[in-house]
Amino acid sequence: LVPHLGDREKRDSVCPQGKYIHPQNNSICCTKCHKGTYLYNDCPGPGQDTDCRECESGSFTASENHLRHCLSCSKCRKEMGQVEISSCTVDRDTVCGCRKNQYRHYWSENLFQCFNCSLCLNGTVHLSCQEKQNTVCTCHAGFFLRENECVSCSNCKKSLECTKLCLPQIENVKGTEDSGTT
C-alpha cells in the first residue's frame, strides 16, 4: 500500500531534495529559495535559476521554501508580560520571552503569559523556578500551599483540602470554640 500524500508533498517528492516541481510543468524541477528569501518567479526551464527575492522588513522565512510570500514577524504580547529576546531578521522570527525571575505559563500551544516566580515566603524552595515552571514550594508547619503560596492555617476552612495539613491547628481552634460554649 502506498501511503497517501498531500498534493504539495506528492509534487515535492518527485524532485530531488532542495528542489520542487514547477506548478505549470511537472517535468521541470526548480531549486527552492534559501531561507530569508521567497519565490518571486518559478524557474523558466531545467537547470535555470529560480527567481528568489529577499524578504522585506517585518517578514521572514526560516527554511528553504517556495513560498509566494514571506511570513509576518511575530510581535511579543505586552499584555501578557512578554518581552523581546531577539528581534526578527529575514531568516528568523522574533523570539519572545519573560523577564528575569519570571516563568512562562502556557494557556495554549502558542500563547504564554509571564508571571513572577514564587518566593516561597513562609516556606522553602523545593524546586527552583524554571523557564516554563514556577518555583515549587514546601510550606513551614502551620502553613499550607494554596496556588503555590504558603497560607496560614488560620485561613483553612474545614471543607478545604488543607484540613489534613492543618489538622492540629484546626483541632485547637475547635477545642477553643467548644470550651467557649460551655
Partner: nanobody, 119 residues
Framework: EVQLLESGGGMVQPGGSLRLSCAAS????????MVWVRQAPGKGLEWVSH????????YYADSVKGRFTISRDNSKNTLYLQMNSLRAEDTAVYYC????????????WGQGTLVTVSS
Amino acid sequence: EVQLLESGGGMVQPGGSLRLSCAASGFTFEHEGMVWVRQAPGKGLEWVSHIGEDGQSTYYADSVKGRFTISRDNSKNTLYLQMNSLRAEDTAVYYCANIPKAGPSFDYWGQGTLVTVSS
C-alpha cells in the same frame, strides 16, 4: 464586589452568528485586559480570545481565527465577542474574565452563557 455577567448565548444553526456581551462592575474595567474562555461538554477550559486594556492588542485561538471578533467599550464597562460562521465544535459555555496578573488562575468570572450550535 467584582461582578461579571455574560449574556447573548443561545441555540443557533451551523453557519449562524451570535454576539456575546460581558457586563463588568466592581473594578476599574479600563485598566484590565479581558479574556473569553470556553468549556465544551466534558472538556477543559480553552482560552478563546483576549483584548488588552487599550483595546488594540487582541489574540484569537487558531480554532476561531477569522470567525470571531473581540471588542470592548470602556465607557460601558462591557466586553463583546462577535461569533460568525459558527460550527458544532463551538458549542460550549462561554465565560469572560480578567487576564490574570498574579498567577495562572482566574480571580473572577461570571456564571457563563451557553452557546449551542446544532442543526
